[in-house]
């Protein structure tokens, strides 16, 4: 059981107050984290509270401002990037968001040696992506879908690609589906370790069907937004990978990296690129039917002036029980010999673990094992491997950092974080300096988050970087809800849940229950993290019990649970939420006449199906930006879990798993359907089709749209959304306003 330390004593009760909705909407109780911007083994940059860019040297204890807030303000910079030779800084301003990761901006180059902005050969605007080379001060940038190279910031640019075209050909940046569902970045170019080569992806979207929606704006006529967006079964982008020698870019030009024959024989994806050395690169490819992944190690052949990917350096990863990997196929972390690597994939028992691959995947040496999962490899040095896992005390929703000594035999394992601040910190991530000389630990909870700096050899804590003292003080007079994380054992399935309980929770009383669900494949909702959010308010002020349940399809508990939903989305995720609700009712403190469910995105899909399950368990529910049919969602994501919507593949389940097919079952529940009209991700089409089906079935429901809002419903829409949902739930639960 994880209980938030209670600060409620009878004598203090009258000075304590419950959370308000306003607290949540104002972000009153938000926390800070500290991630050093490492620039060497012992130095990092950090933007101070007054917006100076300060360089810290851990070993000398000295710090100095490298860029003043005055310089930042002179171009309204919101971000910066120091060149590795420390001669220049780029300043980023005019940030303009595009999709989840992508944005455009204006860039200015500031010369630290003379304290002036670089004049002459200024960068065009707006730029889609810009980055320094890893050594020196070469610049690569993407402008109007083409890649440019500068040897020095003041030099004229060398144009690498010429075929870039809006919505057609993307060079060095991903198209919509690669950005959202495969790379999870705004960029698709990668410098080699010493900046000799620049690799980039070219995405050809010429034949992809386009999603079009209205953007109403303020003009007389709405604009139409057009995005090449492959839905399930549609034509996909065609990807090619090129590498150019940045020292002699005009010599042979960009050289295409060959696709492994077994991948190229049918539709495929490029999934990631990892540089090993300046003359060795590792590419990962994935068949469109995403159960086969190939990792290909390619060498630069000076005699060919191109890249050689011998079959002997192809490593195949295949899943026979589901899709390849977790959410994504894991990426390799290469060791110092520049050919062997460490990688997370399923072991013979179906748990994701670290393996060491020297020659073939078949001969891989398993490094971690157990009925838990290795989650991320942070760093491999000559003698240590740092990784995170959820092994400690068998709580899948925790993250601790471990060190394995790989320099000694047999390797020894040490948990770096397990006993540091055991009650406060059970969910960590880490950020390492060069050669792991030092590292920062960022603890996300369950207590108030704290960031600390550590010695990479001894693991000794050097200093606290951020401990959120102001937040701690602000919370002293707040009645926070209690939280507990426990598990249910049902039919050989373990269902972990988090329950958020009102501050004066009394087991002998009855409380309304709200299920918050996401439930998407390879997700995890039950995590030992700190949060003061809308559901905290609902428990604290409105006296609701809120529960989050990780059912089948969720991550980090083995392949049996994860791959249970393969090819049948919308079945077990819903079943497991319903099963959990029944178990909660049995606990005796739930008012079974006042149970609701809500979710966003995939959670909106699950909540809709749960409401339409015909169980009579739910009085009401909310779906925000739900998927309503898998035929409407992106190919890369959907087909990973569902296969293709064709007769000879899985069309039948595509049709059976829609929300619309269950329209009749909404008759006995109160349903609130919410969607942004400019949702580029889960298109408004999804909710439009639910609404149409409900109208056609003559079923009453409530709905709210947010004009020109995307999948995140940000800004003022957020306030309106949570206010609206609060009213809906309070009405459903007969709670007075």
């Amino acid at each position: 059981i994880v209980l938030r330390p209670s600060r409620v004593h009878n004598s203090e009760e009258n000075t304590m107050r419950a959370l308000t909705l306003k607290d949540i909407l104002n972000g009153t109780f938000s926390y800070k984290t500290f991630f050093p911007n490492w620039i060497s083994g012992q130095e990092y940059l950090h933007q101070s509270a007054d917006n100076n860019i300060v360089l810290y040297n851990i070993e000398t204890g000295q710090s100095y401002t490298i860029l003043s807030n005055r310089t930042m303000k002179s171009v309204n910079a919101s971000n910066y990037g120091l060149s590795p030779d420390r001669q220049f800084v780029y300043l980023e301003s005019d940030y303009s968001k595009l999709w989840r990761y992508s944005y455009t901006a204006t860039y200015y180059i500031y010369d630290l040696s003379n304290g002036e902005f670089v004049r002459g050969n200024e960068l065009p605007r707006p730029i889609q992506y810009l980055c320094w080379s890893p050594v020196g001060s070469k610049l690569a940038y993407v402008y109007q879908n083409n890649i440019y190279l500068k040897q020095r910031p003041g030099d004229p640019p060398f144009q690498i690609t010429f075929n870039g075209r809006e919505n057609k050909i993307f060079n060095g940046i991903p198209d919509w589906v690669y950005e959202e569902e495969m790379l999870a970045t705004k960029y698709a170019l990668w410098w080699s370790p010493n900046g000799k080569f620049l690799a980039y992806a070219e995405f050809n979207d010429t034949d992809i069907p386009v999603i079009a929606y209205s953007y109403y704006g303020d003009e007389q006529y709405p604009r139409t937004i057009n995005i090449p967006y492959p839905k399930a079964g549609a034509k996909n982008p065609v990807v090619r990978i090129f590498i150019i020698d940045t020292t002699y870019p005009a010599y042979v030009g960009p050289q295409e990296v060959p696709v492994p024959a077994m991948i190229a024989s049918s539709d495929y994806y490029f999934s990631w690129l990892t540089w090993v050395t300046d003359e060795r690169v590792c590419l990962q490819w994935l068949k469109r039917v995403q159960n086969v992944s190939v990792l290909s190690i390619c060498d630069f052949r000076e005699d060919w002036q191109t890249w050689d990917c011998p079959k002997t350096q192809e490593h195949i990863e295949e899943s026979r029980t589901g899709w390849a990997g977790g959410f994504f196929v894991s990426t390799p972390v290469f060791s110092y010999d520049a050919i062997s690597y460490y990688k997370i994939f399923s072991d013979k028992d179906g748990y994701k673990h670290i393996h060491y691959i020297k020659d073939t995947v078949e001969n891989a040496i398993q490094i971690t094992s157990g009925k838990w999962e290795a989650i991320n490899i942070f760093r491999v040095t000559q003698d240590s491997l740092f990784y995170s896992s959820n092994e400690f005390e068998e709580y899948p929703g925790r993250r601790n950092i471990y060190r394995i000594s790989i320099g000694s035999y047999p390797p020894s394992k040490k948990c770096v974080t397990c006993h540091l601040r055991k009650e406060r910190c059970q969910y960590y991530t880490a950020s390492f300096s060069d050669y792991a000389k030092y590292y920062a630990l960022v603890c996300y909870g369950p207590g108030i988050p704290i960031s600390t700096l550590h010695d990479g050899r001894t693991d000794q804590e050097i200093k606290i970087l951020e401990e959120n003292k102001e937040l701690e003080n602000a919370l002293k007079n707040i009645q926070l809800p209690k939280e507990e994380i426990k598990k249910l054992e049902v039919d050989e399935i373990t269902l972990w849940y988090k329950m958020i309980l009102p501050p004066q929770f009394d087991r002998s009383k009855k409380y309304p229950l709200l299920i918050q669900v996401y439930g998407g494949p390879c997700s995890q909702s039950v995590r030992s993290v700190f949060a003061v959010n809308w559901i905290s308010y609902l428990a604290s002020k409105e006296g609701m019990v809120i529960a989050l349940v990780d059912g089948r399809g969720t991550a980090f508990q083995g392949d049996k649970l994860l791959y249970a939903v393969y090819r049948k989305l919308g079945v077990y995720e819903v079943e497991d939420q319903i099963t959990a609700v029944r178990k909660f009712i049995e606990m005796g403190f739930i008012d079974e006449k006042r149970i609701a469910i809500w979710g966003w995105s995939y959670g909106g899909y699950v909540s809709s199906l749960a409401l339409a399950s015909g169980t009579g368990l739910f009085k009401c529910g909310i779906a925000v930006a739900p998927v309503s049919s898998w035929e409407y969602y992106a190919s890369v994501y959907t087909e990973r879990f569902m296969g293709l919507p064709t007769k000879d593949d899985n069309l039948e389940h595509y049709k059976n798993s829609t929300v619309m097919a269950r329209a009749e079952y909404f008759r006995n529940v109160d349903y609130l359907l919410i969607h942004g009209t400019a949702d580029d991700n889960v298109h408004f089409q999804n909710s439009a089709q639910i609404a149409k089906a409900l109208v056609n079935a003559q079923v009453d429901f409530q709905a709210m749209w947010y004009s020109d809002q995307n999948h995140g419903l940000s800004g003022l829409s957020t306030n309106h959304l949570y206010t609206h949902m609060t009213h809906f739930l309070k009405q459903c639960f007969s709670l007075s306003d």
């Epitope: 020292t247 010599y251 060959p258 000076e302 005699d303 050689d308």
Partner: antibody, heavy 120, light 111 residues
């Protein structure tokens, strides 16, 4: 037109060293790899290694590693191959050859050859 | 290393005849893009001369009676109608892997 002109014949004693030169003309010297290939009397061709004048990259055949050194002088567009600790079985005609731009490993122009005789 | 075996060792033919020379590699010298096999001609007292590069591409200035074919491990040099000046030693060479290797040569002699 492309030409590779090699230095003259050499007679060396076992244990000595020899340095053969190869002067290039008719093209941009730095752009192409220079290979060295040898041919013992009445025998086939044996690849010794290459040097890339632009990058300074050098690859040697395993069996000659430690005894051979390839260098270039870009100011004179000349490549050099030095072989040390000569043995009688090093007696051969030594060729320099230009790496063909599109050939990806084919040698499109050859020097006339330098006969090195190792004899006591 | 990749071993190249040429056959026959000696080929005796008359001018005007068709010559077929073979080269077999101990492992594939092809990728999805190219076959890294090249052919040279060497006459006594002369340096080798490039005839065919990347298995089938005719080097400029070489008569079109010379042609190359093959992929993977088996390659062929064909001279469609032998001319008197074609009688020489022919070598195949691979650049698929380092070290580069040559075949032992096929001697084409006048019958």
């Amino acid at each position: 037109q492309v030409q590779l002109v090699q230095s003259g014949a050499e007679v060396k004693k076992p244990g000595a060293s020899v340095k053969v030169s190869c002067k290039a003309s008719g093209y941009t010297f730095t752009e192409n790899i220079i290979h060295w290939v040898r041919q013992a009397p009445g025998q086939g061709l044996e690849w010794m290694g290459w040097i890339h004048p632009a990058s300074g990259s050098i690859k040697y055949a395993q069996k000659l590693q430690g005894r051979v050194t390839m260098t270039t002088d870009t100011s004179t567009s000349t490549a050099y191959m030095e072989l040390r600790s000569l043995r009688s079985d090093d007696t051969a005609v030594y060729y320099c050859a230009r790496h063909g731009g599109t050939g990806r490993g084919a040698m499109d122009y050859w020097g006339q050859g330098t006969l090195v005789t190792v004899s006591s | 290393e990749i071993v190249l075996t040429q056959s026959p060792g000696t080929l005796s033919l008359s001018p005007g005849e068709r010559a077929t020379l073979s080269c077999r590699a101990s492992q594939s010298v092809s990728t999805s893009a190219y076959s890294y096999m090249h052919w040279y001609q060497q006459k006594p007292g002369q340096a080798p001369r490039l005839l065919i590069y990347l298995a089938s591409n005719l080097e400029s200035g070489i008569p079109d009676r010379f042609s190359g074919s093959g992929s993977g491990t088996d390659f062929t040099l064909t001279i469609s109608r032998l001319e008197p000046e074609d009688f020489a030693v022919y070598y195949c060479q691979q650049s698929r892997e380092l070290p580069y290797t040559f075949g032992q040569g096929t001697k084409l002699e006048i019958k």
